[in-house]
């Protein structure tokens, strides 16, 4: 059974992930970002279902494509290089989803833009955090 300390750790990790995703979204949505049109041509894949931490597998599998899109963006839109930013997110995702169980991600048929993709995972983090508090 989860202890209060492990719940607290999970909550902090989710909050960190949430902040990273929000930072990326803000950098992309920045009105000075001339790359938005080009970035929106990239297709992202969304999970059919995202209600548990194990579903973060679906986010992990899309981190490389996310890094590619961020490589297009002006570096001044973000505090970190895309590679470092994605690496940080990857570490949190791996800790949150755990490595004990191998979960096969199921993807929805429709693709999403980077903005829709980030918003979906931001909502996921907020929803899990709310169940922990």
């Amino acid at each position: 059974a989860p202890t209060s300390s492990s719940t607290k750790k999970t909550q902090l990790q989710l909050e960190h992930l949430l902040l990273d995703l929000q930072m990326i979204l803000n950098g992309i949505n920045n009105y000075k970002n001339p790359k938005l049109t080009r970035m929106l041509t990239f297709k992202f894949y969304m999970p059919k279902k995202a209600t548990e931490l194990k579903h973060l597998q679906c986010l992990e599998e899309e981190l490389k494509p996310l890094e590619e899109v961020l490589n297009l963006a002006q570096s001044k839109n973000f505090h970190l290089r895309p590679r470092d930013l994605i690496s940080n997110i990857n570490v949190i995702v791996l800790e949150l989803k755990g490595s004990e169980t191998t979960f096969m991600c199921e993807y929805a048929d429709e693709t999403a833009t980077i903005v829709e993709f980030l918003n979906r995972w931001i909502t996921f983090c907020q929803s899990i955090i709310s169940t922990l508090t």
Epitope: Y45, P65, E68
Partner: antibody, heavy 121, light 113 residues
Framework: EIQLQQSGPELRRPGSSVKLSCKAS????????IHWVRHRPEHGLEWIGW????????RYAQKFQSKATLTADTSSNAAYMQLSSLTPEDTATYFC??????????????WGQGTLVTVSS | DIVMTQSPFSLAVSEGEMVTINCKSS????????????LAWYQQKPGQSPKLLIY???TGQSGVPDRFIGSGSGTDFTLTISDVQAEDLADYYC?????????FGAGTKLELK
């Protein structure tokens, strides 16, 4: 028809620099990234970097970071690459390239004919 | 960076034969979301620019003869040329375009026996 027309061969002394051009036709240069690739027969193909002509943003492979400088001029629908501090190892054919219509960055589908740069004293 | 290991270095063939060129990546090039492998194959003839033959590991580029077949997934890929023609003698390169920097294999020279 999409074409990338590159400038002619160059002979340079070690220590000097050279600027190559790549003129696009059949599409607007701001719609796609322009990549540069080096070919040396004994080393094969190496990606140098890309430029987004829309805003001049660039990305370089680490080994070319201080060797190549990519620029673009939207008014002439052309991209340029300057190579500095030339050494005999920079002797190669340099290609500019563009992605497929359906893919935003890679793979390279349209290529210039290449520019041979020879560095010799 | 992703390392692409291509083999063999060179290959001597007779017209009409079938040849296979292999390419191994240091990490998976498969994107789970669309089940596509971000690997391309190029042909380069002496004095010419490279020509895209195959992308997404198995999709033939428009106008490329169907004797060029790409296969494989994850980290192991193959370019098969069935019924080799004299005009196929060239250098062949694989390219991973999953993540920047894109990286090429060292190349395979196809020669006539």
């Amino acid at each position: 028809e999409i074409q990338l027309q590159q400038s002619g061969p160059e002979l340079r002394r070690p220590g000097s620099s050279v600027k190559l051009s790549c003129k696009a036709s059949g599409y607007n240069i701001t719609d796609y990234l322009i990549h540069w690739v080096r070919h040396r027969p004994e080393h094969g193909l190496e990606w140098i970097g890309w430029i987004d002509p829309e805003d001049g943003e660039t990305r370089y492979a680490q080994k070319f970071q201080s060797k190549a400088t990519l620029t673009a001029d939207t008014s002439s629908n052309a991209a340029y690459m300057q190579l500095s501090s030339l050494t005999p190892e920079d002797t190669a054919t340099y290609f500019c390239a563009r992605s497929l219509d359906s893919t935003p960055i890679y793979p390279f589908a349209y290529w210039g004919q290449g520019t041979l740069v020879t560095v010799s004293s | 960076d992703i390392v692409m290991t291509q083999s063999p270095f060179s290959l001597a063939v007779s017209e009409g034969e079938m040849v296979t060129i292999n390419c191994k990546s240091s990490q998976s090039l498969l994107r789970s979301g669309n089940q596509k492998n971000y690997l391309a194959w190029y042909q380069q003839k002496p004095g010419q620019s490279p020509k895209l033959l195959i992308y997404y590991a198995s999709t033939g580029q428009s106008g490329v003869p169907d004797r060029f077949i790409g296969s494989g997934s994850g980290t192991d890929f193959t370019l098969t040329i069935s019924d080799v023609q004299a005009e196929d003698l060239a250098d062949y390169y694989c390219l991973q375009h999953y993540i920047t920097p894109p990286t090429f294999g060292a190349g395979t020279k196809l020669e006539l026996k």
